[in-house]
């Protein structure tokens, strides 16, 4: 019998016939050891690996570049996947990018993008993004035209600020940019007028922080 | 590079008009608020005039209301202050400035143009 | 509108010593956001104003890191660690919390 192949990310997974959103292990190209991701498999008919979840404040989301290159968190909560891992899934076929977002009076929307890709770590894991479409706002929370990727510890944005200090997180800030999903974690009634939120400008305005987002990408041919 | 190259300025007689431009480059202007900025001889610096990145919201500073107009053209990169009934308090040079940060999120001037000189003169 | 007071407003250094510029409002500049919308510029002479620091305390991206901003509410100050001879002209400090944003008078500083 031909030994399976393992899975590259959560559509093989569900190609695989694993229907259920979970945990699964993913062996990425050219990555050394196997990775833990979370795959969404009800949302838009599943076969999402999610590179970022937030939900409850309970992670820190202020670390410098070394942790956002490796990630940090858990899987089964909020989590960064990583910008090596991004990347690196990224680099094995075309993908798609869907971000579900829900502000703290219930209300869902989402953004998606036909293609995504960010460069690599020399590259400052520069956002690449075509075809936005979604309810998350008409014009796109991310930088269309490419945005490097900064922390407090790596200043590659667009302004004569340090944004990711400034607005806290890491993120494909400009100057700063519409969006920051990696902001501080901000309650109920204390969620306005916070620069350094959670933000998706579009949807929610410049000072408002979400209650949750997900970050999630899969193959352009699934 | 930023750029913000300003023209316009001259002499002018009281009660008369004048036009000042500025013309951005080297970023997305429509992604940023700009302002009016002026300076008497040999004084400090006044607040003018500020318009949104969308050019929805407008701020005057009392001293010009009403005789000064601010407005923006997106598509050609250019910021105008359209100045009606000029009055000899108002000879100064005058800066358009940048937002610092975009998206209407205001933290002070990021950028200044080379500054143009106005003078009321009879 | 709120009054923005500097002090000194003369200020003579020799080169490699400090100096600091004292600057009061009359209104508390803490933003409901959590910041203080308190910039500082300085004007060379026959030049246009440059921003040196940014919501109080946060310098501004190629300024020196002779010049720190400090300060919280109504009264703020900008340091400099060692004058140099390029760092003439006339600092203004400027508050944007709340509307009309206003500038303090200036504070000439020049080379003793």
């Known amino acids: 019998r031909e030994e399976e192949k393992p899975f590259r990310d959560c559509a093989d997974v569900y190609q695989a016939g694993f229907n259920k959103s979970g945990i699964y292990t993913i062996y990425i190209n050219n990555m050394p050891e196997p990775k833990k991701v979370f795959c969404n498999m009800d949302v838009n008919g599943g076969g999402w690996t999610v590179i970022q979840h937030r939900e409850d404040g309970s992670l820190d989301f202020q670390r410098g570049w070394k942790e956002y290159k490796m990630g940090f968190g858990n899987p089964s909560g909020e989590y960064w996947l990583g910008n090596e891992f991004i990347f690196a899934i990224t680099s094995q076929r075309q993908y798609m990018l869907r971000i579900e977002l829900m502000d703290w009076e219930g209300n869902r929307a989402y953004s998606q993008y036909d293609r995504f890709h960010i460069g690599n770590e020399k590259q400052n894991y520069r956002l690449y993004l075509k075809g936005h479409t979604g309810t998350a706002g008409k014009q796109s929370s991310l930088i269309l035209h490419g945005a490097d990727f900064s922390t407090k510890d790596a200043d590659n944005d667009n302004c004569m600020c340090k944004c990711a200090l400034m607005l806290t997180g890491g993120w494909w800030f400009d100057a700063c940019g519409p969006s920051n999903l990696n902001g501080m974690f901000y309650t109920a009634g204390q969620n306005h007028g916070k620069l350094n939120g959670i933000k998706w400008h579009y949807f929610k305005g410049p000072s408002y922080s979400l209650r949750s987002t997900t970050m999630m990408i899969r193959p352009l041919d699934f | 590079e930023v750029q913000l190259v300003q023209s316009g300025g001259g002499v002018v007689q009281p009660g008369r008009s004048l036009r000042l431009s500025c013309a951005a480059s080297?970023?997305?202007?429509?992604?940023?608020?700009m302002h009016w900025v002026r300076q008497a001889p040999g004084k400090g610096l006044e607040w003018v005039s500020y318009?949104?990145?969308?050019?929805?919201?407008?701020y005057y500073a009392d001293s010009v209301k009403g005789r000064f107009t601010i407005s923006r053209d997106n598509a050609k990169n250019s910021l105008y202050l359209q100045m009606n009934s000029l009055r000899a308090e108002d000879t100064a040079v005058y800066y358009c400035a940048r937002d610092l940060l975009d998206y209407d999120i205001w933290t002070g001037y990021g950028y200044w143009g080379q500054g143009t000189l106005v003078t009321v003169s009879s | 509108d709120i009054v923005m007071t500097q002090s000194p407003l003369s200020l003579p250094v020799t080169p490699g010593e400090p100096a600091s510029i004292s600057c009061r409002s009359s209104?508390?500049?803490?933003?409901?956001?959590?910041?203080?919308?308190l910039d500082w510029y300085l004007q060379k002479p026959g030049q246009s104003p440059q921003l040196l620091i940014y919501l109080g305390s946060n310098r501004a991206s190629g300024v020196p890191d002779r010049f720190s901003g400090s300060g919280s509410g109504t009264d703020f100050t900008l340091k400099i660690s060692r004058v140099e001879a390029e760092d003439v002209g006339v600092y203004y400090c400027?508050?944007?919390?709340?509307?009309?944003?206003?500038f303090g008078q200036g504070t000439k500083l020049e080379i003793k």
């Open positions: 318009i949104s990145s969308s050019g929805s919201t407008i």
């Open positions: 080297g970023f997305t202007f429509s992604s940023y608020g």
């Open positions: 400027m508050q944007g919390t709340h509307w009309p944003p206003t």
């Open positions: 209104q508390s500049l803490l933003h409901s956001v959590g910041y203080n919308y």
